[in-house]
């Protein structure tokens, strides 16, 4: 059974079917003989009792007050009274946006992480038996989906999925056609979970160099925002005035991670720079990854297989 209307403040859009269901419904069935009344008060009017004669748009069923449809002048306070039980709601009916398929103030926002499961199901359990068909729109363009009773989207989210999704239920009542719109503003955000950072390219790199020339050792990693990338070389970093660690450069990936690069520039290469390890490390809370570079004199290249040289 449809749950009762427990929210004390409700905003609805003019022109749509709407209902209020009080929260002592099971109790009301037990005491059928008890007098049950619905009242409305708005502005100057105090507690006017509602019944089908009040308006052709109003219907009363057991626990429910129905509007076919709700209109701007239905704004006000509503009361259900039964013996010593009273429930009150404040109803605000807002104007429909005539230039869009939905009204901005009646939108439910949802945030979905990219690549995570994303689902929209068009359901309306209260009016289910009256619904002829249901359509799903994205940014007010109809989506062609197989099921026209309960259209559904089930997929892994992509950034292209971001947008306003409107479920529009079409239903008949007393020979008139009505529709009910439920809109979701779907925002796709980057994956918030951390990755294990990884250095890009081969783990061991032999770099062919000439004495007296300069070389740039490129180190790049895919990492999280808080991870660090750094160079380690020699007994004590910074002891060689010809070695310069350039500023780190970061680029955000579409998944919300970062491509970080750090270049080690070695100027006026000397014998002391040859055949020693220059290590680039990426560190995170989850551990570290290291890749190594060894400078080799071009004349000695023949001794090393070609596939181990970097570009």
């Amino acid at each position: 059974a449809e749950s009762c209307t427990s929210r004390p403040h409700i905003t609805v859009v003019e022109g749509e079917p709407f209902y209020l269901k009080h929260c002592s419904c099971s109790l009301a069935h037990e005491i059928e003989t008890t007098t049950k009344s619905w009242y409305k008060s708005s502005g100057s009017q105090e507690h006017v009792e509602l019944n089908p004669r009040s308006s052709s748009r109003i219907a009363l069923h057991d626990c429910v007050l129905e509007f076919w449809p709700v209109e701007l002048n239905d704004t006000g306070s509503y009361f259900f009274q039964m013996k010593n039980y009273t429930q009150k709601w404040k109803l605000n009916v807002i104007r429909r946006n005539k230039h869009s398929c939905f009204t901005e103030r009646q939108v439910t926002s949802k945030i979905v992480e990219v690549k995570k499961f994303f689902q929209i199901t068009c359901e309306n359990s209260y009016y289910q038996t009256l619904v002829n068909s249901t359509s799903l729109y994205k940014n007010c363009k109809k989506l062609l989906l197989e099921n026209n009773k309960n259209p559904t989207i089930k997929k892994n989210a992509e950034f292209e999925d971001q947008g306003y999704y409107s479920c529009v239920h079409f239903l008949h009542h007393n020979g008139k056609l009505f529709n009910i719109t439920k809109t979701f503003n779907i925002t796709i955000v980057e994956d918030r979970s951390n990755i294990v950072p990884v250095l890009l390219g081969p783990k061991l790199n032999h770099v062919a160099v000439e004495l007296g020339k300069n070389v740039r050792l490129n180190c790049s990693a895919l990492l999280n925002e808080e991870d660090v990338i750094y160079w380690m070389f020699g007994e004590e970093n910074g002891s060689d005035p010809n070695i310069h660690e350039e500023k780190e450069m970061r680029i955000m990936t579409p998944e919300g991670k970062w491509h970080a690069s750090k270049v080690l520039r070695i100027e006026n290469i000397g014998e002391s720079n040859l055949n020693v390890l220059y290590n680039c490390t990426v560190a995170s809370t989850g551990g570290t990854d290291t890749k190594s570079f060894i400078l080799v004199r071009k004349a000695d290249m023949a001794d090393i297989p070609g596939h181990v040289f970097t570009r």
């Epitope: 390219g201 180190c219 790049s220 690069s261």
Partner: antibody, heavy 119, light 107 residues
Framework: QVQLQQSGPGLVKPSQTLSLTCAIS??????????WNWIRQSPSRGLEWLGR?????????DYAVSVKSRITINPDTSKNQFSLQLNSVTPEDTAVYYC?????????WGQGTMVTVSS | EIVLTQSPATLSLSPGERATLSCRAS??????LAWYQQKPGQAPRLLIY???NRATGIPARFSGSGSGTDFTLTISSLEPEDFAVYYC?????????FGGGTKVEIK
């Protein structure tokens, strides 16, 4: 100092392909210290990032969702340049197109190419 | 995507006055925010990156501050050549986006 020089036609017919090239001087398209972007500007859309290419042990390309199905950005290491191709253009694609280096931010901009889509 | 809202749309000031431009992000971009200056018929020029760092060759009268969602570009004393349109841009969320701009005009 780094400079970007753009070239390509200023008039493209609807449904055809917009093609622009950006020649890099003072830097390398395969540097680890930058990415190479295309950004466009129109009165209706303002400044809009379209996509980029960059090298980090391999080539990466990222594109804006709005043009993802129509765009290709290619590096050319032999000529030290990169190009933009935008397929199936409509009058909505009329804009000034810029090629831009991304270092600390979008730090070096080409001179811009006004592209009009019209029959 | 992140929406960057710049205010005011237009700022009318005289040379020598202080200009304060605001940029607000729809969600946090950490400190990954840049400011650009654009003059008619020219490409934008980078002024400030990562919220508060001046780009190479930018005069000290330009300064940036802020983090998270609220950022400010301050021009301490306007020079005649500073009258232009200023844009903010974020790279702390995917995809990179720009604000709509603030025009600083001569009063």
């Amino acid at each position: 100092q780094v400079q970007l020089q753009q070239s390509g036609p200023g008039l493209v017919k609807p449904s055809q392909t917009l093609s622009l090239t950006c020649a890099i001087s003072g830097d390398s398209v395969s540097t680890y210290s930058a990415a190479w972007n295309w950004i466009r500007q129109s009165p209706s859309r303002g400044l809009e990032w379209l996509g980029r290419t960059y090298y980090r042990s391999e080539w990466y390309n990222d594109y804006a969702v709005s043009v993802k199905s129509r765009i290709t950005i290619n590096p050319d290491t032999s000529k030290n340049q990169f190009s933009l191709q935008l397929n199936s253009v409509t009058p909505e694609d009329t804009a000034v197109y810029y090629c831009v280096r991304e270092g600390d931010a979008f730090d070096i901009w080409g001179q811009g190419t006004m592209v009009t889509v019209s029959s | 995507e992140i929406v960057l809202t710049q205010s005011p749309a237009t700022l009318s000031l005289s040379p020598g006055e202080r200009a304060t431009l605001s940029c607000r992000a729809s969600q946090s971009v950490s400190s990954y925010l840049a400011w650009y200056q654009q003059k008619p018929g020219q490409a934008p020029r980078l002024l400030i990156y990562d919220a508060s760092n001046r780009a190479t060759g930018i005069p000290a009268r330009f300064s940036g501050s802020g983090s998270g969602t609220d950022f400010t570009l301050t021009i301490s004393s306007l020079e005649p050549e500073d009258f232009a349109v200023y844009y903010c841009q974020q790279r702390g969320n995917w995809p990179p986006t720009f604000g709509g701009g603030t025009k600083v005009e001569i009063k």
